[in-house]
């Protein structure tokens, strides 16, 4: 997370850390708890060449990475079938946990938005994660969860910005309908935040608007952060994840 600050302990109870096996269970992406047994993340975190179940764990909300790990095994990794690269889209995946999480005030699910929600500019939105704090600058110990408030940008404006200084023709969309843009040169997500949630407060409820997906650098001029637009994939999500009763 570029800019922003350490998150208060009481906030973002749906935030999770994805861990990959190595010399230690290393954080590599974020995710969000959308059901007691399901995590939403980015497809590029776990695909297109899917890792072994044995190589992956999920850590629920913790204030500092690695300090009180209780790693959870995953029973299924579901990558959106249309995913190839983040820039093309469909950068969304689901992880099914072997056991449902015991929800509490500290750890619970985030609400998915209604299909009609557009998340217009001006809406109060935040992105969270344990990713880099600037381009090629890692989050330092004790690795606190960070948060930053990011401004939403309309897709057509964001697409125009991404065409500035790019070789892509103006008639070729870079920012697609299944994407959402947020951030500026002072506030952005970054490497290691991928898969984590962009949430917006709508009528008093936090809704997950996006999944951290891609961008050219972090907090670069004319290059806002790009997120997978959750509303675009609600039907796909609910094909696997039970709706709340």
């Amino acid at each position: 997370i570029v800019g922003g600050q350490e998150a208060p302990r009481s906030k973002w109870p749906w935030q999770v850390s994805l861990r990959v096996h190595g010399p230690y269970w290393m954080h590599f992406c974020g995710g969000s708890l959308i059901h007691p047994q399901w995590v939403l993340t980015a497809a590029h975190c776990v695909g297109p060449d899917v890792k072994d179940l044995a190589a992956l764990r999920v850590q629920l909300r913790e204030q500092h990475l690695y300090y009180q790990d209780q790693l959870l095994p995953v029973s299924r990794i579901i990558v959106h079938p249309q995913f190839y690269t983040a820039q093309i889209g469909a950068d969304i995946a689901l992880l099914e946990l072997e056991e449902p999480v015991n929800v509490s005030s500290h750890v619970h699910t985030v609400t998915l938005p209604p299909a009609s929600e557009t998340f217009p500019p001006g809406m109060p939105c935040w992105v969270t994660g344990w990713g880099d704090v600037d381009n090629d600058e890692r989050l330092p110990p004790p690795f606190p969860l960070k948060q930053v408030k990011v401004p939403i940008m309309e897709n057509h404006i964001c697409d125009a910005k991404y065409h500035l200084g790019a070789y892509t023709g103006d008639d070729v969309r870079i920012v697609r309908d299944d994407m959402l843009c947020a951030g500026n040169t002072r506030r952005d997500s970054c490497q290691g935040d991928s898969g984590g949630p962009l949430v917006c407060k709508v009528n008093g409820t936090w809704l997950q608007a996006g999944v951290v997906s891609w961008g050219e650098g972090c907090a670069q001029p004319n290059r806002p952060g790009i997120y997978t637009r959750v509303t675009y994939y609600l039907d796909w999500i609910h094909h696997y994840v039970p709706k709340k009763p």
């Epitope: 096996h21 047994q37 060449d49 899917v50 890792k51 072994d52 179940l53 044995a54 190589a55 095994p73 029973s75 299924r76 990794i77 099914e96 072997e98 056991e99 449902p100």
Partner: antibody, heavy 119, light 106 residues
């Protein structure tokens, strides 16, 4: 001592049913995913089914889906395999095994129990 | 489903020989697991996460590989190594074992 002891095997007619049990001791049973593996006479190992620590997730080999049911009773430290509609090709030694908590290999095995399906 | 193919199915070797068993997965996996079984006995864990030796396994054993091709190697075969070895993946369900490689005395 960490131990798994299977029981319940025996001779059963085709179409019949049998319930295997696996008694666990020497470790916190409720912390571990458990697995059944079988081995037909003179053949190789074949994975049968998996059950997660709290029973929320179960998976079966395709040939056993719908006929076999894996379950567990954590209060009794016991794993079960209910086998219905048994066929001659289900004849095998059935092993109960524990999945290692960190590394997912099968680190503790029972001695096995022989199931013979024959008329 | 991922299929596992071991080769050879059996081999004859002498004490002191270097022995290599291969396991090929039908699609890419991260890790390979190996088990040793002797006649009339339960299988024992032998190698996990491709190259880590299970407790009590002698250092003459090693494992390697990535993607779809993995190997178990015995640098200098000893009398107690004559057994059948099985590979297994833990990529996704259903789990599958290789058909086994029987290491026999020449």
């Amino acid at each position: 001592e960490v131990q798994l002891v299977e029981s319940g095997g025996g001779l059963v007619q085709p179409g019949g049913s049998l319930r295997l049990s696996c008694a666990a001791s020497g470790f916190t049973f409720s912390d571990y995913g458990m697995v059944w593996v079988r081995q037909a006479p003179g053949k190789g190992l074949e994975w049968v089914a998996f059950i997660s620590s709290g029973s929320s997730t179960v998976y079966y080999a395709d040939t056993m889906k719908g006929r076999f049911t894996i379950s567990r009773d954590n209060s009794k430290n016991t794993l079960y395999l209910q086998m219905n509609s048994l066929r001659a090709e289900d004849t095998a030694v059935y092993y109960c095994t524990r999945r290692n908590y960190d590394d997912f290999y099968f680190d503790v095995w029972g001695q096995g129990t022989l199931v013979t399906v024959s008329s | 489903d991922i299929q596992m193919t071991q080769s050879p199915s059996s081999l004859s070797a002498s004490v002191g020989d270097r022995v290599t068993i291969t396991c090929s997965a039908s699609s890419s996996v991260t890790y390979m697991y190996w088990y040793q079984q002797k006649p009339g006995k339960s299988p024992k864990p032998w190698i996990y996460r491709t190259s880590d030796l299970a407790s009590g396994v002698p250092s003459r054993f090693s494992g390697s590989g990535s993607g779809t091709d993995f190997t178990l190697t015995i640098s200098s075969l000893q009398p107690e190594d004559f057994a059948t070895y099985y590979c297994q993946h833990y990529h996704s369900y259903p789990l599958t074992f290789g058909q086994g490689t029987k290491v026999e005395i020449k």
